[in-house]
């Protein structure tokens, strides 16, 4: 059966300076290959995190995502500012052998909505 | 740099339990998955024991499920592995070793050996 | 179980290939160890099938491909000789495999 991703919220509001938590749980680890989040949709969207042992920034993961058997993928993004605004998308990989990883699912978005102070 | 320092091994008879330790510097030690893997003389390698970062969730193949315990101590940087019952065949040098992301491991102690024999 | 040959030789400068086979892609990553002697210090060379630690010499490279995965070494230098053993972490039984290791001999 095909990995579902799930997006629980439609959109969150967040004051800048504040963090705010988007949620993102998977039924399966399978096919094996590693889960990130974008900001925006096509050619121009931005890597925001990745679950590849990177560090990135005012972003962590919310669960324990070295759990083996570990289904969210959710995360947390501290210090919000204006420029944060926007959809921003968890995304399944396959793993690629020599070509690159190839986007299996993804989940249906999570607008980002900045609020001033 | 990261660092990997296994201590407790030593001689014990057949029967007897043990504990080892693996002391770990050089990187955040309670955002890592750990592992122990050994190695008989004259051996390949065989997997042991995996514990997620927070320590609440422990992995072990059957040849060992029951009988060996993997903990860790997040406060003090320290990984362990109890050793119940040990029989001539545990008989091996034991490492510590951090996981990736995605369970393989990227780091290694160099290893403490230890002997059953009666 | 991971299958890997027993042995491999190769002259300075030639191109080394050691499979490793038995984990199903759809479920598996693998991983490749150096051991210069038995007993002694571990050095992971490949990780995530083809990623190297940044202190390892680009000439080791790694790839995987349906249920084999493949250590290269262009260029294989005397510093070389050691047992290689793949690893491999399989997501659908939460367990981790190593190979049996192979022993490459320069010549």
């Known amino acids: 059966t095909e990995v579902k991703v799930t997006q629980p919220e439609k959109s969150v509001s967040v004051a800048a300076g504040d963090s705010t938590i988007l949620n993102c749980t998977v039924t399966s680890l399978l096919p094996v290959g590693p889960i990130r989040w974008y900001r925006g949709v096509g050619q121009s969207r931005l890597l925001i995190y990745s679950f590849t042992g990177e560090h990135f920034p005012r972003i962590r993961n919310v669960s324990d995502t070295t759990k083996r058997n570990n289904m969210d993928f959710s995360i947390r993004i501290s210090n919000v500012t204006p420029e944060d605004a926007g959809t921003y998308y968890c995304v399944k990989f396959q793993r690629g052998s020599s070509e690159p990883d190839t986007e299996i699912q993804s989940g249906g978005g999570t607008e980002v909505y900045v609020l001033a102070k | 740099d990261v660092q990997l320092v296994e201590s407790g091994g030593g001689v014990v008879r057949p029967g007897e339990s043990l504990r080892l330790s693996c002391a770990a510097s050089?990187?955040?030690?309670?955002?890592?998955?750990m592992s122990w893997v050994r190695q008989a003389p004259g051996k390949g390698l065989e997997w042991l024991a995996g514990?997620?970062?927070?320590?609440?969730?422990?992995y072990y193949p059957a040849s060992v499920k029951g009988r060996f315990t993997i903990s860790r101590d997040n406060s003090k940087n320290t990984l362990y592995l109890q050793m119940n019952t040990l029989t001539a065949e545990d008989t091996a040098v034991y490492y510590c070793?951090?996981?990736?992301?995605?369970?393989?491991?990227?780091?290694w102690g160099l290893g403490t050996l230890v002997t059953v024999s009666s | 179980a991971l299958t890997q040959p027993a042995s491999v030789s190769a002259n300075p400068g030639e191109t080394v290939k050691i499979a490793c086979s038995g984990g199903?892609?759809?479920?598996?990553?693998y991983g490749w160890y150096q051991q210069k002697a038995p007993g002694s210090a571990l050095v992971t060379v490949i990780?995530?099938?083809?990623k190297r630690p940044s202190d390892i010499p680009s000439r080791f490279s790694g790839s995987a491909s349906g249920s084999t995965a493949t250590l290269t070494i262009t260029g294989v230098r005397a510093e070389d000789e050691a047992v290689y053993y793949c690893?491999?972490?399989?997501?659908?039984?939460?367990?981790?495999?190593f190979g049996a290791g192979t022993t490459l001999t320069v010549l």
């Open positions: 199903d892609y759809y479920s598996y990553y």
């Open positions: 514990i997620s970062a927070g320590g609440s969730d422990t």
């Open positions: 690893g491999g972490y399989d997501y659908s039984t939460y367990a981790n495999a």
């Open positions: 050089g990187f955040t030690f309670s955002s890592n998955a």
């Open positions: 990780y995530s099938d083809d």
């Open positions: 070793a951090r996981e990736t992301w995605n369970h393989l491991f990227d780091y």
